[in-house]
Interface confidence: low
Amino acid sequence: EVEKTACPSGKKAREIDESLIFYKKWELEACVDAALLATQMDRVNAIPFTYEQLDVLKHKLDELYPQGYPESVIQHLGYLFLKMSPEDIRKWNVTSLETLKALLEVNKGHEMSPQVATLIDRFVKGRGQLDKDTLDTLTAFYPGYLCSLSPEELSSVPPSSIWAVRPQDLDTCDPRQLDVLYPKARLAFQNMNGSEYFVKIQSFLGGAPTEDLKALSQQNVSMDLATFMKLRTDAVLPLTVAEVQKLLGPHVEGLKAEERHRPVRDWILRQRQDDLDTLGLGLQGGIPNGYLVLDLSMQEALS
C-alpha cells in the first residue's frame, strides 16, 4: 500500500507522458489522477515505466474501479496486463475480440499463464460458447489451446467452430479429447465430397469408431501410417485384413515397420495368419490356421 502524500507543487500530471518516468512511486501516487490515467491508458504502453511504477498505476486503477475495470481500460492495458492477478481478471467482463487479441499480444511468445487462462475463460463464458472467431484467435496465439481443454470443456465447442481447427492444433490432444471432437468434425464436414472430407477429417480420426473406419475403407482414401497409428486400438481391432488394406492403399507396406507397436501389434494378434499372409509383408503373430476364434467382446458382454 502506497502512503498518501500531497503532490509537490508543479508536479500534478496534466497528461500521461514520458516525464512521468522520472517520478518516484509516491509522486506517481500523489500526482497522477486515476481518471486521467483511465482515459489515457493507451499511452502507458509507449512509456518505459519500471515494474514498480506499473504497480502504482495498477493500484490507482484498482482504487478507481474496485468492482473491475471497464473494457475501455482493459483494451489498452498493454504490459500492465502482466501485473494483473487471476483474481483481478475474474472481475472483468470482456466481450470484444479486439480486447482479447490486444491482451494476448502482450503475452505472445510465452506459454499460457494463469492470467491468460482466466482471461480466456472470462471471454468464452461471456460469449456462451467457443465460437469460430474466438477459436481462430486462440489457436493462432496458442496452437495447443484446444488440447489444453478437458473433454468436458470440449463438449461445449459447437461443430461450426471445428472449421477453424488446423491439424497442428490437435497435435497434443489425447484419445479422450479426440473422442469428443471427432463427432463434431463429422457433423461439420458432412456435406463435403469424399476426398475433401477425408483431408478435413483426417486429423480427428483418433476419435473415430470402427464403423466409420470401415466406411472410409470403401472410399479409396489411402490413409497414411502416421494417421493409422493414432487410431483408437478398440476401433482398429475389428477391422478385417481386407478393410485395412483398402484403408491404407499403397501405405499398407508400412505395417511391417510398425508391427511391434499399437494398434498394429494388437490388430495382428486378432487376424488369421493366412489372411495376414495375403498382404505379402511377412507379418507374424496371427491366429494359426485351424484354431477356433472366440469373440471375447461378446463373451464379456454376456458374463
Partner: antibody, heavy 121, light 107 residues
Framework: EVQLVESGGGLVKPGGSLRLSCAAS????????MSWVRQAPGKGLEWVGR??????????DYAAPVKGRFTISRDDSKNTLYLQMNSLKTEDTAVYYC????????????WGQGTLVTVSS | DIQMTQSPSSLSASVGDRVTITCRAS??????LNWYQQKPGKAPKLLIY???SLQSGVPSRFSGSGSGTDFTLTISSLQPEDFATYYC?????????FGGGTKVEIK
C-alpha cells in the same frame, strides 16, 4: 456473503425417497454449474453428479452408483438446487454437500455445510 | 473412469515440518487437479486448483505441482491449523473423482 445451505436430510428406509434442497445466495446462481458431493461416515469424498447452467445447456451428469436413481434439477428463479433420491440403499448413507463448479476448471470452490441422509431399516 | 491414488493415507508430523502428499491419476489429466483440506465436521475447502494455482485467501505455505499423472501438495512449514485430511480431485472428465484422502496428524 456467498453461501450455500442444504436442507431435507433425515432418516429414510431402504427403497424410500428423499429430496434435498440447496439454497444459494451471494453469487449469480444461474451462471453456476452446481454439483452434489457426498461423504459416507468416516469415508472419503465422492462426486454424485452435476447440472450445468442453462446457458451451457442445463445438462446433467451422474456417478455410476446413483445413475437412474438420483435426479439433479435447478430452479434459477428461486436460486435453488435439488437432489431427488429414489430407491435409496443403505450405502447411500452420507453427508450430502452442495457445491459450485468453476466452469473452466471444474473445481468446487463454494460448499454448503452439508446435510446428513441416513438410510436404515 | 479415472482413478486417483493418494499416498500416504496418513502421516504424523510436527509443527514446522515440511509435508508432502502425492496423488497419482490412472491416466493423464494434464493440469486438471485440485487439492482440498477438510477438518472434522466441516465442509472441504479448496486450497489449490489447476495443479499449482493457489486459491485466494489460502496461505502461501501451501503449494501444488505436477502435470500429467503425478501431482504433489506441499506444506512448507506445518502450522497447528493444518492438521486435517487432504484430498486430491481430478477435474479432467466426468465422473469427477477424488483421491482416498491423506490424514495429517500431530506427532
Amino acid at each position: 456473503e456467498v453461501q450455500l445451505v442444504e436442507s431435507g436430510g433425515g432418516l429414510v428406509k431402504p427403497g424410500g425417497s428423499l429430496r434435498l434442497s440447496c439454497a444459494a445466495s451471494g453469487f449469480t446462481f444461474s451462471n453456476a454449474w452446481m454439483s452434489w458431493v457426498r461423504q459416507a461416515p468416516g469415508k472419503g469424498l465422492e462426486w454424485v453428479g452435476r447440472i450445468k447452467s442453462k446457458t451451457d445447456g442445463g445438462t446433467t451428469d451422474y456417478a455410476a452408483p446413483v445413475k437412474g436413481r438420483f435426479t439433479i434439477s435447478r430452479d434459477d428463479s428461486k436460486n435453488t438446487l435439488y437432489l431427488q433420491m429414489n430407491s435409496l440403499k443403505t450405502e447411500d448413507t452420507a453427508v450430502y454437500y452442495c457445491t459450485t463448479d468453476l466452469p473452466k476448471l471444474r473445481n468446487f470452490h463454494i460448499w454448503g455445510q452439508g446435510t446428513l441422509v441416513t438410510v436404515s431399516s | 473412469d479415472i482413478q486417483m491414488t493418494q499416498s500416504p493415507s496418513s502421516l504424523s508430523a510436527s509443527v514446522g515440518d515440511r509435508v508432502t502428499i502425492t496423488c497419482r491419476a490412472s491416466q493423464s489429466i494434464s493440469s486438471y487437479l485440485n487439492w482440498y483440506q477438510q477438518k472434522p465436521g466441516k465442509a472441504p475447502k479448496l486450497l489449490i486448483y489447476a495443479a499449482s494455482s493457489l486459491q485466494s485467501g489460502v496461505p502461501s505455505r501451501f503449494s501444488g505441482s505436477g502435470s500429467g499423472t503425478d501431482f504433489t501438495l506441499t506444506i512448507s512449514s506445518l502450522q497447528p491449523e493444518d492438521f486435517a485430511t487432504y484430498y486430491c480431485q481430478q477435474s479432467y472428465s466426468t465422473p469427477l473423482t477424488f483421491g482416498g484422502g491423506t490424514k495429517v496428524e500431530i506427532k
